[in-house]
Every structure is written in structure tokens, then in C-alpha cells.
């Protein structure tokens, strides 16, 4: 029976990624019943993209090394809608590392996936970023602006925000 | 079940490139970080690197840094691997394989293997 094999492929496909991710949140995509897309529980989920609020306090390297550890990044964010999305899981009196970084401390800044980076689809906060020194970014809020991203010293642990690709199973 | 076909070995004289490919069969590719690992005659599966889900992450062994380049295209479902300043002791039949998530080193952690591409270098 075609439904039984397809389910017992999947349930195979879950337990190889159980000791990462426990629990797993699917949905089917469209009206094609082949096509589950998943998320870890109790990650969230936009387009096709798992977002995870990260609330230890760590340095950027090492917040990096924590997302990559669950199969992520920390979060490349490409558009203003997945950014006001990002910002309904925030906490305004925080602040989140993301996956931009300017190791040279020339201002080329770099997403951690390599996706180009585009001036044209930036949040900085106005008058950011400032300082040659602060080589990592982060978002914050503030209340003249509200959410907007600064660059900070990469070494001062923050919050972060970890990205994955959806898990398709 | 992910399927891999490694292309591209061949024969290449010391101080020359080639460029590994590995197809993989279905779009769960980007469920998976990837890796390439290598068997020289008697001896055992040896690391050689590996790559994040994203390609964000990559990992190399010490014998091929700087010497190699390991690439994924997600939108094609392929992976790749730049060896250039190819030496004698880089002979070996080359496998790519996959495991889930997060990216490894061990062998044991990978689901999934080619049948492998050979590499012989000549001096």
C-alpha cells in the first residue's frame, strides 16, 4: 500500500534526526501529500525557514557554534517581512546576535551562509553601524526607531537567533 | 532513501586539479550536511571534508587544507569538491555521503554513501 510505505519512510526519516531534535512540528505543504516540511518543537516557522530564540548569553563565535550544533546558522535575514516576523518572538529589553559579521573591520560585512550581502535590504539602526571596532551585529530596539541592528564587539555575549532550513521529510 | 552519485575522478599528474561532483537524488539534500571521504589501497576510510546543511560550515582534514574546496549547490542538489596541488598520496577512491543535520568528521555519522570516484595521481 502506497499511504503505509510513504508513512514508514518518514517515520524512518524522524529518527534519524531524534538526537538533534526530539520532537518535530510537520505540516503538509500544498495539496501534495508527499511534501511535509518540519521544524523542531518548539522552533518557529516562516516560509521555508525554523527560527530559534536563542536566550543564553554568548560571545558571537560561540553563538554561531550553538546554532551550528542544532543544524543551523545563526539568522541571515533577506527581506522586512521575515524580519517583522523575527521581531514578534523578541524581547524589546534584549538584544540578539545575527549572522552578519565584519571580520576585517573594513565594513564588508558578510552573512555567515555566504548569501551576498545587499545595502538595499538593511535594518541598521540611523548612525549605524559606527565603530570599526564592533565587527558583529546584533538587532535591538529602540523606541525612536524601534527594531534595528548595531554593530557591537563580537566578544560581548548577547541573546541570538538561530536559522535553519525547514526539514523535509 | 538518498541516493549519491559521485563523477568526476580520473587520472592526474602531481601539481594538477580535478573537480568532484556528487548528485543526490532527491531535494531532502538540504536536510543533510555533507562530507567527502577517501580510501587509499589497504588502508581505511579517511576524512576529508565536510560541509553545514547552509554552507556555512566547513571542515577540512590537515593533509588537504588549503589544497582543497569543498562547495554545495542547494538549488541543484550537488556537491562538490575542488582539488587543486593534487599529490601521489591523494590517490585513493573518493566517496561523498550525507548525515542529518549537523555536520561530522567520523564516518559513522553518515547515513549515506556513493559507490565512489576513483583519483589516481601520478608523479
Known amino acids: 500500500n502506497f499511504m503505509y510505505s510513504k508513512t514508514v519512510k518518514r517515520l524512518s526519516k524522524l529518527r534519524e534526526y531524534q538526537q538533534y531534535h526530539p520532537s518535530l512540528t510537520c505540516v503538509m505543504e500544498g495539496k501534495d501529500i508527499e511534501d511535509w516540511s518540519c521544524c523542531p518543537t518548539p522552533w518557529t516557522s516562516f516560509q521555508s525557514s525554523c527560527y530559534f530564540i536563542s536566550t543564553g548569553m554568548q560571545s558571537w563565535t560561540k553563538s554561531q557554534k550553538n546554532c551550528s550544533v542544532m543544524g543551523a546558522d545563526l539568522v541571515v535575514i533577506n527581506t522586512r517581512e521575515e524580519q517583522d516576523f523575527i521581531i514578534q518572538n523578541l524581547k524589546r529589553n534584549s538584544s540578539y546576535f545575527l549572522g552578519l559579521s565584519d571580520p576585517g573591520g573594513r565594513r564588508h560585512w558578510q552573512w555567515v551562509d555566504q548569501t551576498p550581502y545587499n545595502e538595499n535590504v538593511t535594518f541598521w539602526h540611523s548612525g549605524e553601524p559606527n565603530n570599526l571596532d564592533e565587527r558583529c551585529a546584533i538587532i535591538n530596539f529602540r523606541s525612536s526607531e524601534e527594531w534595528g541592528w548595531n554593530d557591537i564587539h563580537c566578544h560581548v555575549p548577547q541573546k541570538s537567533i538561530c536559522k535553519m532550513k525547514k526539514i523535509y521529510i | 532513501q538518498v541516493q549519491l552519485q559521485e563523477s568526476g575522478g580520473g587520472l592526474v599528474q602531481a601539481g594538477g586539479s580535478l573537480r568532484l561532483s556528487c548528485a543526490a537524488s532527491?531535494?531532502?539534500?538540504?536536510?543533510?550536511?555533507m562530507g567527502w571521504f577517501r580510501q587509499g589501497p589497504g588502508k581505511d576510510r579517511a576524512f576529508v571534508a565536510a560541509?553545514?546543511?547552509?554552507?556555512?560550515?566547513?571542515s577540512y582534514a590537515d593533509s588537504v587544507k588549503g589544497r582543497f574546496t569543498i562547495s554545495r549547490d542547494n538549488a541543484e542538489n550537488i556537491l562538490y569538491l575542488q582539488m587543486n596541488s593534487l599529490k601521489p598520496e591523494d590517490t585513493a577512491v573518493y566517496y561523498c555521503?550525507?548525515?542529518?543535520?549537523?555536520?561530522?568528521?567520523?564516518?559513522?555519522?553518515?547515513?549515506?554513501w556513493g559507490q565512489g570516484t576513483q583519483v589516481t595521481v601520478s608523479s
Open positions: 560541509i553545514s546543511r547552509s554552507g556555512s560550515s566547513t
Open positions: 555521503a550525507a548525515a542529518p543535520l549537523v555536520l561530522k568528521t567520523t564516518p559513522g555519522a553518515y547515513n549515506y
Open positions: 532527491e531535494r531532502t539534500f538540504t536536510n543533510y550536511a
